[in-house]
């Protein structure tokens, strides 16, 4: 019997593996080399949403398309090879931090050149799957003494990214200490990323089980065919019904001018590592993507003068000596962005039980996505929080951090 891979169906250097097909026959599965994807590796990734970087390796949107930002010592489109290694070599090694949920990595002589020793409660080649374990009464303490020193260093250390370690002290969860702190069902953080409906976790406090119970056959993400179009046409004053869906960000409320606003409580505050002028240049894209992730409508909060509340975020000064600050203007390394959440269309949709009632719950959800490495957002977020509503600040106010 001819192998289904005989015809070399995988393009662009993709690896073909025979796999069970319908009716008991054989078909093939292509394992694509980055940045290619699709059933035959025939498509080129144009956004980080389409590019699968190795676990722990962030994706960066560059002028030449999405790229995996490889850790030191690894290179290649998938961060799988050492500099100078032959094409096709697949030395993933432990440098890419492939082991999830506190698992420790050991080098191995055969591909994929690592083995994971999983923390309690996790299984799988990368410790990616919850082990079938009895419900525990509380989460384990942080198993690694080294994690204490790494907390709050603004780098997500994968081996400390577990609830017991406080998601590396918030470094892996956008500084949200525990996104699931309101959730009474203890294991919901384990089930958040399993793409299955877990009814015990579908409450607002448990972050709607990552919308697993709500999807109900609906698209989870905006159709890539529409995505760029919907970002371009977001809040442009024209109603585009193709973009007027929760997964595409409700077209920036272009189709809802007659529907009264329904603001969630508080303000969603994000620190984005892009200066204000750069962020504002792509504001429609930024807001559309974030609205799509949260499945509701986001917009900038306006100050008393009607200006968007996007303030410069300065590099924290070591020791914060006042003299040094006077001598050198602090470097602007990002923006503090204040957003309003408008649930007018979320609450009008047929399944209207999945809207974020306040900014903090939206912040928790973003923190949870980040903690389980599912935050598909091309703008570099440093932290996120919900704040109670205060009177709008005057436009000359600047945030100093």
């Amino acid at each position: 019997v001819l192998s289904p891979c005989e015809s070399q169906p995988c393009q662009h250097g993709g690896q073909c593996r025979p796999s069970p097909g319908p009716g008991g026959g054989l078909t093939f599965t292509c394992h694509c080399a980055q940045p290619f994807w699709g059933p035959r590796c025939e498509r080129v990734a144009r956004s980080c949403r389409e590019l699968q970087c190795p676990v722990g390796v962030p994706c960066q949107q560059t002028p030449r398309g999405p790229r995996c930002a490889c850790p030191p010592g690894l290179s290649g489109p998938s961060c799988r090879s050492f500099p100078g290694s032959p094409p096709g070599a697949s030395n993933a090694s432990c440098a890419a931090a492939p082991c999830l949920h506190g698992g420790s990595c050991r080098p191995a002589p055969l591909a994929p050149f690592f083995r994971c020793a999983c923390a309690q409660g996790w299984t799988g080649p990368r410790c990616e799957a919850p082990a079938a374990a009895p419900e525990v009464s509380e989460e384990p303490r942080c198993p690694r003494a080294a994690c204490q020193a790494k907390r709050g260093d603004q780098r997500c250390d994968r081996e400390c990214n577990s609830p017991g370690c406080g998601w590396d002290g918030g470094d892996c969860s956008l500084s949200v200490g525990d996104p699931w702190r309101q959730c009474e069902a203890l294991q919901c953080w384990r089930l958040f990323n399993n793409s299955r409906c877990d009814p015990a976790c579908s409450s607002p406090a448990c972050l709607y089980d990552n919308f697993d119970c709500h999807a109900g056959g609906r698209e989870r993400t905006c159709n890539p065919v529409y995505e760029k179009y919907c970002a371009d046409h977001f809040a442009d004053g024209r109603c585009d019904q193709g973009c007027n869906t929760e997964e595409c960000g409700w077209d920036g409320l272009d189709c809802a001018s007659e529907v009264p606003a329904l603001l969630a409580r508080g303000v969603l505050v994000l620190t984005v590592l892009l200066p204000p002028e750069e962020l504002l240049r792509s504001s429609a894209d930024f807001l559309q993507r974030l609205s799509a992730i949260l499945r509701t409508s986001l917009r900038f909060r306006l100050d008393a003068h009607g200006q968007a509340m996007v303030f410069p975020y300065h590099r924290p000064s070591p020791g914060s000596e006042p003299r040094a600050r006077r001598e050198l203007a602090p470097e602007v390394i990002g923006s503090v962005v204040m957003l309003e959440i408008d649930n007018r269309l979320c609450l009008q949709s047929p399944e209207n039980d999945h809207c974020f009632p306040d900014a903090q719950s939206a912040a928790d959800y973003l923190g949870a996505l980040s903690a389980v490495e599912r935050l598909d957002f091309p703008y570099p977020l440093r932290d996120v929080r919900g704040e109670p509503l205060e009177p709008p600040e005057p436009s000359h106010h600047h945030h100093h951090h």
């Epitope: 024209r238 809802a256 001018s257 504002l280 968007a308």
Partner: antibody
Framework: QVQLVESGGGLVKPGGSLRLSCAAS????????MHWVRQAPGKGLEWVGR??????????DYAAPVKGRFTISRDDSKNTLYLQMNSLKTEDTAVYYC??????????WGQGTLVTVSS | DIQMTQSPSSLSASVGDRVTITCRAS??????LNWYQQKPGKAPKLLIY???NLQSGVPSRFSGSGSGTDFTLTISSLQPEDFATYYC?????????FGQGTKVEIK
């Protein structure tokens, strides 16, 4: 009633600058995307650019012939849209209209203001 | 940029005639096409939006059709007040662009 009134047009020399204003009344100006469109004497309509509401970043887009020379801005506290025109050329001579885009296409246009660029 | 080409550039017709103006886009614009009417010294007036939707207050003798790249404006029975210049405009992608116009004159 809903109204847009342009002002600031006039005669200017090539290389000079001019700022057009568009005063809005009868609607909540701050929530609308606003456009500038121009029409050279005896010619067709040409889209100049647009600006989004400040709640969505107030970002502006421009047509290629004016990009880098013209700047669209808005002052929601004054219900006014602006078009700052620098490095003017003779081919910028036109009637300039401001227009309100609306989701359900109830468009509103001003009466236009004439800009003449001539030495 | 998306180019919009209207034809004819001008036409002569009599009251009661059926008039058809076509507009072609240089690439697909789905149904993101608007038709405007302009009379001398006046601002343009929106007649048809999203290719086939009649703007409120516009007489039903005006109709629009088409999608993708080819579009048509039809006036089923020309009236004296319809003598004007008609423009198509795409708002699919910035920069938004207009056709060069079709002048409808009295025969």
């Amino acid at each position: 009633q809903v109204q847009l009134v342009e002002s600031g047009g006039g005669l200017v020399k090539p290389g000079g600058s001019l700022r057009l204003s568009c005063a809005a009344s009868g609607f909540t100006f701050s929530t609308y995307v606003m456009h500038w469109v121009r029409q050279a004497p005896g010619k067709g309509l040409e889209w100049v650019g647009r600006i989004r509401a400040n709640a969505y970043g107030g970002a502006a887009d421009y047509a290629a012939p004016v990009k880098g020379r013209f700047t669209i801005s808005r002052d929601d506290s004054k219900n006014t849209l602006y078009l700052q025109m620098n490095s003017l050329k003779t081919e910028d001579t036109a009637v300039y209209y401001c227009a309100r885009a609306e989701a359900r296409y109830r468009d509103v246009w001003g009466q236009g203001t004439l800009v003449t660029v001539s030495s | 940029d998306i180019q919009m080409t209207q034809s004819p550039s001008s036409l002569s017709a009599s009251v009661g005639d059926r008039v058809t103006i076509t507009c072609r886009a240089s690439q697909s614009i789905s149904s993101h096409l608007n038709w405007y009417q302009q009379k001398p010294g006046k601002a343009p007036k929106l007649l048809i939006y999203a290719a086939s939707n009649l703007q409120s207050g516009v007489p039903s003798r005006f109709s629009g059709s088409g999608s993708g790249t080819d579009f048509t404006l039809t006036i089923s029975s020309l009236q004296p007040e319809d003598f004007a210049t008609y423009y198509c405009q795409q708002d699919y992608h910035t920069p938004f662009t207009f056709g060069q116009g079709t002048k409808v004159e009295i025969k």
